[in-house]
């Protein structure tokens, strides 16, 4: 219908354009006429697939007019002026938004043009991660959780750990009507090892530049593991004293250190000082077995070590005179 | 006050030419594309076709197999809507109406009898 | 070309009843529907744009609906001065086309 040989006029408009729930967002929409081509625009329309009726109109002589007026407004067309710009504001989007938009141009002579435009409604979501205290149990428990809030679309977590371990990810409702709150937790057993050591909950979604990292440091409860140090086989008469460390790791932290030995109580060569243990020089061999008991909120545990005060001095100073 | 005055009735002979003129007060001219639609008596509406004023773009229904022919002057605010190789179903109301998408004024309407 | 067929093709009604015209489109046409009133000896006058949006200075109990092809004109409550003919047009794409129109008489 147009004369022949016409330039075609255009529609620009993004194919899909974020928001955020509660905020305003604006929908671009505009007529690109190419140099030499003119035309005529006396209607600017948008309306939404699947509703009957549209929802906001600019007319050449009646101005604007919309469905919902306290939540749209077109944002350059105005009485008296080119409409060549349908770009449309909408404010305070709800879920129930979106979906796909058409803005129309009626346009003299080349007729109507429009495009669609696809409203994506998102919901940034709010991330905590936290550890989840946990004793030696033997079997997989959740050692930490990471929780995505309010989300739209939901959340992707991921996590990231040398532990081993798996992921257990399950969704709900969120506060706002259309969000949704995503939970997950990291599975693994319990040990010693896993204690102080950290993992990482990645949660990306489209709101985000970039994904955001949490880090966990976990708790794992345990009793003590106990060794003991300070001996190297090489002890000797007529040396200074030395010392053994009653070594432990355990969480809570140790609350008491107790030394014996297999026959009973200390003997009175061997003073303890909480973890440590000083063994006073010594006139006659010794081979007595030393006992250190730890105990934290989790109970007691225990190692043993033998120790041996053998004759002849050693040709370069060691064992006694170790400290 | 828009206003769009059409010239008078007219009485042609099948095969002749007419042109009727449309005068408009009220708004500028050349911000609004003018229209033409006929209504034979009784019956229903029919577009024609329509121009803008400023840049002379056209658009005609085709149904009209190039008989006709709008034009405008600037000058005096008017259009023009010529129709030739006039038959005797051309008979009919002839209206020019200011364009918005839809028509918003109309001239009061010109009289176009073809009869031999 | 788009067919535009209003129904009825002519009704009458009596002051104050509700009087409902439809016009259905042979193709998509989006919201891009005018309706007109047009008494006799008169040029049409344009009530409704877009479907459903009132001319200013056109009584209120007028009101239009719909999209894609289904399109209704409303009058809540019918006058006296709405005796006319009603006709619906779409100017989605070339050539416009206009209904057969509706004659609406009071009783």
């Known amino acids: 219908w147009p004369p022949p040989g016409t330039g075609d006029i255009i529609v620009q408009a993004p194919t899909q354009v974020p928001g955020f729930l509660g905020d305003s967002v604006t929908l671009p929409c505009y007529l690109q006429v190419p140099g030499m081509e003119e035309t005529h625009v006396s209607q600017l329309t948008w309306s939404r697939h699947g509703e009957s009726g549209s929802m906001a109109v600019f007319h050449q002589t009646q101005g604007p007019n919309y469905s919902e007026p306290k939540r749209l407004e077109f944002v350059a067309a105005r009485l008296g002026t080119e409409l060549r710009d349908a770009s449309l504001r909408m404010f305070g989007l709800r879920v129930e938004d979106e979906g796909n938009y058409t803005c129309l141009f009626v346009t003299f002579p080349q007729g109507s043009r429009s495009v669609d435009i696809w409203l994506r409604v998102l919901a940034k979501p709010q991330n905590t991660a936290e550890v989840q205290k946990v004793q030696l149990t033997g079997k997989p428990v959740p050692v930490a959780r990471c929780v995505s809030t309010g989300g739209r679309p939901p959340a992707h977590i991921t996590w990231h750990s040398d532990l081993g371990g798996m992921p257990n990810t399950s969704q709900a409702p969120g506060f706002l009507s259309g969000t949704v709150t995503v939970t997950s937790l990291w599975i693994l057993v319990p040990s010693s090892q896993v204690d102080g050591k950290s993992v990482t909950c990645k949660v990306e979604h489209e709101s985000f530049e970039k994904p955001q990292l949490l880090t966990v440091n976990l708790t794992v409860y345990y009793p003590p593991e106990v060794s003991i140090s300070g001996y190297d086989n090489n002890w000797y008469l007529s040396q200074n004293e030395a010392t053994l460390t009653c070594d432990a790791r355990s969480n809570p932290e140790p609350t008491g250190y107790n030394w014996s030995t297999t026959m009973g109580p200390l003997p009175p060569f061997a003073v303890a000082q909480g973890a440590q243990l000083l063994i006073r020089p010594v006139d006659k061999p010794i081979n007595t077995t030393f006992i250190c008991n730890v105990t934290n909120a989790l109970g007691a545990r225990q190692a043993e070590l033998t120790v041996q005060v053998k004759e002849g001095p050693p040709s370069e100073p060691s064992g006694m005179s170790s400290n | 006050e828009v206003q769009l005055v059409q010239s008078g009735s007219e009485l042609k002979k099948p095969g002749a030419s007419v042109k009727v003129s449309c005068k408009t007060s009220?708004?500028?001219?050349?911000?609004?594309?003018m229209h033409w639609v006929r209504q034979p008596h009784g019956k229903g509406l029919e577009w024609i076709g329509g121009?803008?004023?400023?840049?002379?773009?056209?658009s005609y229904n085709q149904r009209f197999k190039g008989r006709v022919t709008i034009t405008v002057d600037k000058s005096t605010s008017t259009a023009y809507m010529e129709l030739s190789s006039l038959r005797s179903e051309d008979t009919a109301v002839y209206y020019c109406?200011?364009?918005?998408?839809?028509?918003?004024?109309w001239g009061q309407g010109t009289l176009v009898t073809v009869s031999s | 070309d788009i067919q535009m067929t209003q129904s009825p093709s002519a009704m009458s009604a009596s002051v104050g009843d509700r009087v409902t015209i439809t016009c259905k489109a042979s193709?998509?046409?989006?919201?891009?529907v005018a309706w007109y009133q047009q008494k006799p000896g008169q040029p049409p006058k344009a009530l409704i744009y877009?479907?459903?949006y009132r001319y200013s200075g056109v009584p209120d109990r007028f009101s239009g609906s719909g999209s894609g092809t289904d399109f209704t004109l409303t009058i809540s409550s019918l006058q006296a001065e709405d005796l006319a003919e009603y006709f619906c047009?779409?100017?989605?794409?070339?050539?416009?086309?206009f209904g057969q129109g509706t004659k609406l008489e009071i009783k």
């Open positions: 877009s479907a459903s």
């Open positions: 109406a200011r364009w918005t998408g839809d028509f918003d004024y």
């Open positions: 193709q998509n046409v989006g919201t891009n």
């Open positions: 121009i803008h004023p400023n840049s002379g773009g056209t």
């Open positions: 009220g708004y500028t001219f050349t911000e609004y594309t």
């Open positions: 047009q779409q100017y989605q794409s070339y050539p416009y086309t």
